[in-house]
């Protein structure tokens, strides 16, 4: 009966050698793809000279296969019932799933100019930077290939800086041959309701990026959740991509390849300003750009990015306040395409399908002492790209799942 099934499930979702969960956990059996859409700036000169609205045109998808590498340094700790690991990063370009090649060119914000002018706000240093920007013939915008933009390029301006700085710039640099973690998660041996929940990340229970509860590492990594998921639950998870924990709420029942799953979505409330959602007060880290914490839908993660003014949002500024998207023309947010969801099989807690969507933006501000930013009359949170990372259980795995799990129950 039900108790026997519960007992079997509890046994099989433990993260230890020999269980179904462990095998799929170490190396995902699902093919995961990350699609990128780049925001190609159509009017760079007008923006730089007249502080016009930035006209963007998205180009994509450019697709990469990701998360194909097995977890590394997997170490069980019998004493505290945890398992620690590193999640290696790797990306393989998929030409057949892309609209062009990695050599395609895009006009985008000059990442180094925007970041350096933000990090070094001292006027004397800005004057030094200005002379180097001019000397390197850099400008507010630049033309870069997809490969350069994502994975890194040697910046000509930074190469002239006479003190030690990283001269290679890229939105995901470094990526290949790096790893995320160390993660230490509960294996569920002593308490199945804690399985996959993160105990520590990089050796700490807090991130040191935020104040108060915002700094906590909550829940799992979203690949799975403790079994017997209820629709009333709020599912907490941590995403290193956005340097914070977040949550998903039940939206609807979905049938995925004959398997009944619960669709959990990231609600707009998670992106709201503290005015609407007081819990979010600690995600508001400064008063000027956020208009005294009244703006919403963008997350300043500069503290997590060595001071670089990176802002994370949903694609096309979905769920963001009008003031954020007002200086940008060409955005068309819609929930279906741009929200994040997780399809969770409720008995096992496994995420069988997901779509993680986010947008990477960079803040650029006027600067009295930097010529190429001198004519700007306002701050811009400039969209650089948005991504859609998806994974769906394969047909074979779905058959196995139906016969071994959902079939047995029904």
């Amino acid at each position: 009966g039900d108790l026997l099934i519960q007992k079997t499930i509890k046994k099989q979702v433990v993260l230890e050698e020999g269980t179904i969960a462990f095998k799929n956990w170490v190396k995902t059996g699902t093919e995961v793809y990350r699609q990128f859409w780049i925001f190609d700036v159509q009017n760079p000169q007008e923006v730089m000279m007249n502080s016009s609205n930035i006209q963007v045109k998205q180009r994509g998808p450019y697709t990469y296969r990701v998360r194909f590498l097995a977890k590394e340094n997997v170490t069980q700790d019998a004493e505290d019932n945890t398992v620690s690991f590193l999640q290696p990063n790797g990306a393989i370009f998929e030409p057949s799933l892309s609209v062009g090649t990695e050599a395609d060119n895009f006009t985008v914000l000059n990442l180094a100019v925007a970041a350096a002018s933000h990090i070094y706000q001292n006027q004397f240093v800005q004057m030094i930077l200005n002379s180097l920007i001019n000397k390197s013939k850099s400008s507010m915008f630049q033309v870069r290939t997809l490969r350069e933009l994502l994975w890194g390029y040697r910046d000509p301006f930074l190469s002239l800086v006479p003190y030690p700085v990283t001269t290679t710039v890229g939105l995901f640099y470094p990526y290949n041959n790096t790893a995320d973690g160390v993660y230490k998660v509960f294996n569920g041996k002593d308490n199945i309701s804690k399985v996959a929940i993160i105990d520590t990340y990089k050796g700490k229970r807090n991130l040191s990026y935020w104040e108060s509860h915002c700094d906590m590492i909550n829940g799992t990594d979203a690949a799975s959740f403790p079994p017997f998921v209820e629709k009333s639950q709020v599912l907490q998870f941590f995403s290193s991509d956005i340097c914070r924990s977040i949550y998903a709420v039940f939206e609807s029942d979905v049938n995925l390849k004959g398997i009944p799953v619960y669709r959990f979505v990231l609600p707009s409330k998670a992106f709201a300003s503290p005015v609407e959602n007081p819990d979010n007060y600690c995600f508001c880290t400064e008063k000027i750009i956020s208009k005294n914490c009244t703006s919403y839908g963008v997350l300043d993660i500069s503290k997590c990015k060595e001071g670089r003014p990176v802002y994370i949002s949903l694609p096309h500024f979905l769920y963001a306040s009008p003031d954020v998207s007002e200086p940008i023309d060409g955005l068309n947010p819609n929930e279906e395409e741009h929200r994040t969801y997780l399809d969770i099989e409720p008995i096992t807690g496994f995420t069988l399908q997901f779509a993680k969507r986010l947008q990477v933006n960079l803040l650029v501000k006027p600067s009295e002492k930097i010529q190429v930013l001198k004519n700007l009359k306002r701050n811009y949170i400039v969209p650089i790209l948005w991504l859609n990372e998806t994974g769906t259980i394969g047909d074979e795995k779905a058959n196995m799942f139906r016969s071994q799990v959902t079939g047995k129950i029904n």
């Epitope: 070094y120 001292n122 006027q123 004397f124 240093v125 004057m127 030094i128 006479p162 003190y163 009295e368």
Partner: antibody
Framework: QIQLVQSGPELVKPGASVKISCETS????????MHWVKQSHGKSLEWIGG????????KYNQKFKGKATLTVDKSSSTAYMELRSLTSEDSAVYYC???????????WGQGTLVTVSA | ETTVTQSPASLSVATGEKVTIRCITS??????MNWYQQKPGEPPKLLIS???TLRPGVPSRFSSGGYGTDFVFTVENMLSEDVADYYC?????????FGAGTKLELK
């Protein structure tokens, strides 16, 4: 309050070097640029260069490149300027001056008189 | 390098009179001009910073104007304590450059 106290007068021989200090107090030393300014007797002011203690970024007036070297000691909140291969042309009062946010040369040291004479 | 031409080199003015000093720059520097006062045996003192901003504690008889390449510094009612050398400084670009100075004396 903010104070910049410079080392005393120097009498040096031609061809020698001299190192002038500027000890600061009353502010976060690393956050503000320290500049050095030359004033020859009865003449105008000349900007020698500046140093941002936070990251050690320096910029010199081309005219003083090779003549002046700017350094800082963060632990003692002190800025230094070394002048080398001195000639009578280098005889002058040298000031250190500190910025305040976006204000240039908001605070000044009392000046150090350097006399180059055989 | 932006050169700064300051005039006049010296000026003799009676108490209560208006004083005007001019600085012309070789390049457009927006409003990045600063004005300093230096009394004998003392370091210079900042009176007016970029954007024609009068510094706190500086008497309102001092003012400045100008944009681009032409700048004017004014003392509205000359007092004996205003006897000093006055310098303009452009802070638009490096190297920072001063004017040659104006010696202001009492008539």
């Amino acid at each position: 309050q903010i104070q910049l106290v410079q080392s005393g007068p120097e009498l040096v021989k031609p061809g020698a070097s001299v190192k002038i200090s500027c000890e600061t107090s009353g502010h976060t030393f690393t956050e503000y640029t320290m500049h050095w300014v030359k004033q020859s007797h009865g003449k105008s002011l000349e900007w020698i260069g500046g140093i941002y203690p936070n990251n050690g970024a320096t910029k010199y007036n081309q005219k003083f490149k090779g003549k002046a070297t700017l350094t800082v000691d963060k632990s003692s909140s002190t800025a230094y300027m070394e002048l080398r291969s001195l000639t009578s042309e280098d005889s002058a009062v040298y000031y250190c001056a500190r910025d305040r946010y976006d204000v240039w040369f908001a605070y000044w040291g009392q000046g150090t008189l350097v006399t180059v004479s055989a | 390098e932006t050169t700064v031409t300051q005039s006049p080199a010296s000026l003799s003015v009676a108490t209560g009179e208006k004083v005007t000093i001019r600085c012309i720059t070789s390049t457009d520097i927006d409003d990045d001009m600063n004005w300093y006062q230096q009394k004998p045996g003392e370091p210079p003192k900042l009176l007016i910073s970029e954007g024609n901003t009068l510094r706190p504690g500086v008497p309102s008889r001092f003012s400045s104007g100008g944009y681009g390449t032409d700048f004017v510094f004014t003392v509205e009612n000359m007092l004996s304590e205003d006897v000093a050398d006055y310098y303009c400084l452009q802070s638009d670009n490096l190297p920072l450059t001063f004017g040659a100075g104006t010696k202001l004396e009492l008539k």
